[in-house]
């Protein structure tokens, strides 16, 4: 920690400006006052500190807000965020995604941190589930976030949500939570009609039940092979030829290549060969 | 071994019909569509149509519809194409090939002429 | 219908070179390609299915990539037995079109 000292004549800071980065550490300390930087934070991330500098700073920060900043200085830390603990984070109350928005932008580009998932898990635990305009903020930054999550964390977002999710970002996501996704993305699709609803709901479809897919082979969708192969097994199972037939369209052609590939495999041991002759693809059960 | 085995050559005069056959052996014949293709002398390769031996299921090209009928034999399994009203641009080496594209015939060639 | 648009309609190349041939599609046929190579007098012979798979007996110095409309066939270090016509054709519903061909000769 720097020693207490007093700050020497004429060099106490009016302002926060670039004649800091010419401050030793031990006259930051003494020199630049805790609550005008607070108020000046804004002003930090145009100025080229040192990391020692800026650790400092963050010292000055603690000691004036010892229980969490308040938002008006989390909103503008910048480059200090990365400077920032989970334990320091823990004690923030961040309710604003303009906030949350600065804060990500810092750490774009980078894998998801310590720091950020803190961040991230005390903006939506106050906010009290993953609404639309946050699931979209997180997305654009990390794709893979809604993946990351546990069933159990899914199961707070609400339908409402399911909006904004892109197909990329469903692109890790097990089984367990397309199982938890699946039924919120039914709901919120409900009301398109037959082609629009299969384009939105195809990238949850790996946590459809066989009925739904039955269904869905009565509306001309034509599911590519990809789609195809991350549905649930048990789910695929139970379908006739003709009804995947019917869910593929022109692409039953790929069935061929994937023959030895689950679900495709257990499904074509499933059916009578008279059934998988019907396809003409020369598939053997 | 596997094989699709056509006639080498059929002559046939302006107008006639001719029926051309190809006959599969060594592979569930019932288990793959058969295609028929279509390649004139010195040309590309045109597809015609595609007959499923178990649905009886056929897909034509609109050009050749009007002429050409794909019938299957599953007792001997062998494919057919039948030709009618010829004229001297249906000449041309025909193929009959399985589904999948590993299997081709060798071709017969039709000539008509008078 | 999907219309399939092969090229170079010829190219002349030299033993040991390599050479691209490129098919595109009218539309979107997923990865639903094939490719064939024939010789003067002779059926056509499978190389490629699949867009990029090998068919059996195939030699490695053939390789198909691309995927929706746009596709290609590059042949690596030809030897003289390369030589011939080869021919791309969509495999995703009917009709089965192929394209025009491209005509490979020795330099």
């Known amino acids: 920690e720097v020693e207490k000292t007093a700050c020497p004549s004429g060099k106490k800071a009016p302002e926060i400006d670039e004649s800091l980065i010419f401050y030793k550490k031990w006259e930051l300390e003494a020199c630049v006052d805790a609550a005008l930087l607070a108020t000046q934070m804004d002003r930090v991330n145009a100025i080229p500190f040192t990391y020692e500098q800026l650790d400092v700073l963050k010292h000055k920060l603690d000691e004036l807000y010892p229980q969490g900043y308040p938002e008006s200085v989390i909103q503008h830390l910048g480059y200090l965020f990365l400077k920032m603990s989970p334990e320091d984070i823990r004690k923030w109350n961040v309710t604003s995604l303009e906030t949350l928005k600065a804060l990500l932008e810092v750490n774009k580009g980078h894998e998801m941190s310590p720091q950020v998932a803190t961040l991230i898990d005390r903006f939506v635990k106050g906010r009290g589930q993953l609404d639309k305009d946050t699931l979209d903020t997180l997305t654009a930054f990390y794709p893979g976030y809604l993946c990351s999550l546990s069933p159990e964390e899914l199961s707070s977002v609400p339908p409402s949500s399911i909006w904004a999710v892109r197909p990329q970002d469903l692109d890790t996501c097990d089984p367990r939570q397309l199982d938890v996704l699946y039924p919120k993305a039914r709901l919120a699709f409900q009301n398109m009609n037959g082609s629009e609803y299969f384009v939105k709901i195809q990238s949850f479809l790996g946590g459809a039940p066989t009925e739904d897919l039955k269904a869905l082979s009565q509306q001309n969708v034509s599911m590519d092979l990809a789609t195809f192969m991350k549905l649930r097994t048990d789910a695929v199972l139970p379908l006739t030829v003709a009804e995947v037939q019917k869910l593929l369209g022109p692409h039953v052609e790929g069935l061929k290549a994937e023959e030895r590939h689950r679900p495709v495999r257990d499904w074509i041991l499933r059916q009578r060969q008279d059934d998988l002759d019907t396809l003409g693809l020369g598939l053997q059960g | 071994q596997v094989q699709l085995q056509q006639p080498g050559t059929e002559l046939v005069k302006p107008g006639a019909s001719v029926r051309l056959s190809c006959r599969a052996s060594?592979?569930?014949?019932?288990?793959?569509?058969m295609h028929w293709v279509k390649q004139r002398p010195g040309q590309g390769l045109e597809w015609l149509g595609n007959?499923?031996?178990?649905?009886?299921?056929?897909n034509y090209n609109e050009k050749f519809r009007n002429r050409a009928t794909l019938a299957v034999d599953k007792s001997s399994t062998t494919a057919y194409l039948q030709l009618t009203s010829l004229t001297s641009e249906d000449s041309a080496v025909y193929f009959c090939?399985?589904?999948?594209?590993?299997?081709w015939g060798q071709g017969t060639t039709l000539t008509v002429s008078s | 219908d999907i219309q399939m648009t092969q090229s170079p309609a010829s190219l002349s190349a030299s033993v040991g070179e390599t050479v691209t041939i490129t098919c595109r599609a009218s539309?979107?046929?997923?990865?639903?390609l094939a490719w064939y190579q024939q010789k003067q007098g002779k059926s056509p012979q499978l190389l490629v299915y699949?867009?990029?798979t090998l068919a059996e007996g195939v030699s490695s110095r053939f390789s198909g990539s691309g995927s929706g409309t746009q596709f290609s066939l590059k042949i690596n270090s030809l030897q003289p037995e390369d030589f011939g016509t080869y021919y791309c054709?969509?495999?995703?519903?009917?009709?089965?079109?192929f394209g025009g061909g491209t005509k490979l000769e020795i330099r």
């Open positions: 090939v399985r589904h999948d594209g590993f299997l």
């Open positions: 007959i499923n031996p178990t649905t009886g299921d056929i």
């Open positions: 060594g592979y569930s014949f019932s288990s793959y569509w």
């Open positions: 699949y867009a990029k």
């Open positions: 539309e979107n046929i997923y990865s639903y």
């Open positions: 054709q969509h495999q995703f519903g009917t009709p089965r079109t």
